[in-house]
């Protein structure tokens, strides 16, 4: 299937629409820090030459690498050395290695302003008076902010955020309308954002063998009527579409996400009696909607595991001929009769499955060795049980936000060194695993929450990787993926830690907090309950509780006042004596 | 469970101290704030003031500042309201209460437990 020109064969598929959109997302997860402006006018004269390519595929340059004409686009930009400084060292090289020098700049946390919302009137103002212009600059700055996000997703985004607009910009009250909408929207987005992270960090960082493990076992979940080797080629096709968009090859990965969901469609009959709403929706839409399908039923009667992966006395001969094969065979066996158990519990169980084979077809008699293998399961399924349980009655006790800050002191007291920052966010999203996964009846607990707490431990990892500064985070991130909560829920009081210093600048609060919105004040509060803990590692939770609530009483007294600015001061000095009196600080 | 029990109260003439205390057992003392309010005939229950669950800060209202100190001695589970230059105004049933788990520290609704209260009554 070679073209002439790659770039006029993917124009011609994806349209010019799309074919502008994912350049200019492709651009801005590389080059993070260049104005809109920039953007547009390199997206613009790419746009230009494939047109040309199109007319005339045998036109100079159009055989050039998507790769070679996008990064040589990419060098052109004059203050590339001032802006990103070694970055600007990547055009010295020559494709691939250009390329895979670009993707290792992508920044997790760029130093960029937080995005505020202006005004709903001067948003519709904007909207209406260049369309193109308001939407192009909401694919760039999520583009930008979140250099992984998945391309052909971020098109859906955008098709939504148009959508809002036309409905509300027109509404009696706009506000109403629209900001539910924008919530809703930023929400999504986030929790898309950091599910695609996580796929793009197990491909990067653990290969292509542990992607296509997670992609057998939740696939098997979703489509548990299909058959494997109907399984096994979306699992290869799904790997494609996630290898090209992590690796920053979006026109590729959106072309064949269409193909895929094309070929889904057309075979629906063989995957899943789920799918007929999905397939009769426009291209984004059903891309989306496949991707978030309910699991399908299971089939009735499916027989003992046992007997093919236990009992029978060909196991060795069939993992000794096509081991992957076979392990993969074992995996969607378990997982289509699994939807009750995590992905990464379902990983586990085929790796422990592996290692035994592993020994015991090397044994005397491996069928003695291995016969017990089933009964190694049990404390691996019922590790993540208790903990859940445990979890969810303590989030039902405490409600979302003192959850989190229990689990605030949890992981600060497990790696204090972690920036607070890094700490306030990922213990905040650990904490809505409460609301998102508690109120689910036991058979979807675990796959609700496990699987969405290694999407955020892998926020971690990835922040982490940018600035290491605990060997206890780089050891649970790097040593296995499926073990990774697993290892973090291991982790006890970090001993080693010497305590912070006492600053008294990071307790100084101002009158500003009084105007914030309840998150940005929760953020605050708990930012402080963080280098509470870094300077008290020993304090106790109800000695915590307890400064936490008298730093309740003084924010809610100094907002009350008349002179807010002098009480923060005056109020806030006594607050922090007190606390250094009751805890030594 | 908790049981708070208030004593010192009485009827004293205006410019008259009084010192109240307020005895708990039960649930643990030390980790909680402790709340003073009062009650006037006809009128909603008051705050009066907070003393943290260390004895290191308290809050008052302003009708009482500078006139009243609350403090805490956790050995014994008891908090007092050291209440000076009493005024009629200051007639009222006053009753401690300890820190619920939310809600305002400035609002009843923000306390669990409370005792059943002492009679304060300034006569001019």
């Known amino acids: 299937d070679a073209h002439k020109s790659e770039v006029a064969h993917r124009f011609k598929d994806l349209g010019e629409e799309n074919f502008k959109a994912l350049v200019l997302i492709a651009f801005a997860q590389y080059l993070q820090q260049c104005p809109f402006e920039d953007h547009v006018k390199l997206v613009n004269e790419v746009t230009e030459f494939a047109k040309t390519c199109v007319a005339d595929e045998s036109a100079e340059n159009c055989d050039k690498s998507l790769h070679t004409l996008f990064g040589d686009k990419l060098c052109t930009v004059a203050t590339l050395r001032e802006t990103y400084g070694e970055m600007a060292d990547c055009c010295a090289k020559q494709e691939p290695e250009r390329n895979e020098c670009f993707l290792q700049h992508k920044d997790d946390n760029p130093n960029l302003p937080r995005l505020v919302r202006p005004e709903v009137d001067v948003m519709c103002t904007a909207f209406h008076d260049n369309e193109e212009t308001f939407l192009k600059k909401y694919l760039y700055e999520i583009a930008r902010r979140h250099p992984y996000f998945y391309a052909p997703e971020l098109l859906f985004f955008a098709k939504r955020y148009k959508a809002a607009f036309t409905e509300c910009c027109q509404a009696a009250d706009k506000a109403a309308c629209l900001l539910p909408k924008l919530d809703e929207l930023r929400d999504e987005g986030k929790a898309s954002s950091a599910k695609q992270r996580l796929k793009c960090a197990s491909l990067q960082k653990f290969g292509e063998r542990a992607f296509k493990a997670w992609a057998v076992a939740r696939l098997s979940q979703r489509f548990p009527k299909a058959e494997f080797a109907e399984v096994s080629k979306l699992v290869t096709d799904l790997t494609k579409v996630h290898t090209e968009c992590c690796h920053g090859d979006l026109l590729e990965c959106a072309d064949d996400r269409a193909d895929l969901a094309k070929y889904i469609c057309e075979n629906q009959d063989s995957i899943s009696s789920k799918l007929k709403e999905c397939c009769e929706k426009p291209l984004l839409e059903k891309s989306h909607c496949i991707a978030e399908v309910e699991n399908d039923e299971m089939p009735a009667d499916l027989p003992s595991l046992a007997a093919d992966f236990v009992e029978s006395k060909d196991v060795c001969k069939n993992y000794a001929e096509a081991k992957d094969v076979f392990l993969g065979m074992f995996l969607y066996e378990y997982a289509r009769r699994h939807p009750d158990y995590s992905v990464v519990l379902l990983l586990r169980l085929a790796k422990t499955y592996e290692t035994t084979l592993e020994k015991c077809c090397a044994a005397a008699d491996p069928h003695e060795c291995y016969a017990k293998v089933f009964d190694e399961f049990k404390p691996l399924v019922e590790e993540p049980q208790n903990l859940i349980k445990q979890n969810c009655e303590l989030f039902e006790q405490l409600g979302e936000y003192k959850f989190q800050n229990a689990l605030l002191v949890r992981y600060t007291k497990k790696v204090p060194q972690v920036s607070t920052p890094t700490l306030v966010e990922v213990s905040r999203n650990l904490g809505k695993v409460g609301s998102k996964c508690c109120k689910h009846p036991e058979a979807k607990r675990m796959p609700c929450a496990e699987d969405y707490l290694s999407v955020v431990l892998n926020q971690l990892c990835v922040l982490h990787e940018k600035t290491p500064v605990s060997d206890r985070v780089t050891k649970c991130c790097t040593e296995s993926l499926v073990n990774r909560r697993p290892c973090f829920s291991a982790l006890e009081v970090d001993e080693t830690y010497v305590p912070k210093e006492f600053n008294a600048e990071t307790f100084t609060f101002h009158a500003d907090i009084c105007t914030l919105s309840e998150k940005e004040r929760q953020i605050k509060k708990q930012t402080a309950l963080v280098e509470l803990v870094k300077h008290k590692p020993k304090a106790t939770k109800e000695q915590l509780k307890a400064v936490m609530d008298d730093f309740a009483a003084f924010v809610e007294k100094c907002c009350k006042a008349d002179d807010k600015e002098t009480c923060f001061a005056e109020e806030g000095k006594k607050l922090v004596a007190a606390s250094q009196a009751a805890l030594g600080l | 469970q908790v049981q708070l029990v208030e004593s010192g109260g009485g009827l004293v003439q205006a410019g008259d101290s009084l010192r109240l205390s307020c005895a708990a057992s039960g649930r643990t003392f030390s980790g909680y704030a402790m709340g003073w309010f009062r009650q006037a005939p006809g009128k909603e229950r008051e705050f009066v003031a907070r003393?943290?669950?260390?004895?290191?800060?308290?809050y008052y209202a302003d009708s009482v500042k500078g006139r009243f100190t609350g403090s805490r001695d956790n050995a014994k589970n008891t908090v007092y309201l050291q209440m000076n230059s009493l005024k009629p105004e200051d007639t009222a049933v006053y009753y401690c209460?300890?820190?619920?788990?939310?809600?305002?520290?400035?609002?009843?609704?923000?306390?669990?437990?409370w005792g059943q209260g002492t009679q304060v009554t300034v006569s001019s």
């Open positions: 209460a300890q820190r619920g788990d939310s809600g305002s520290n400035y609002d009843p609704s923000g306390y669990r437990y």
């Open positions: 003393i943290n669950w260390s004895g290191t800060l308290t």
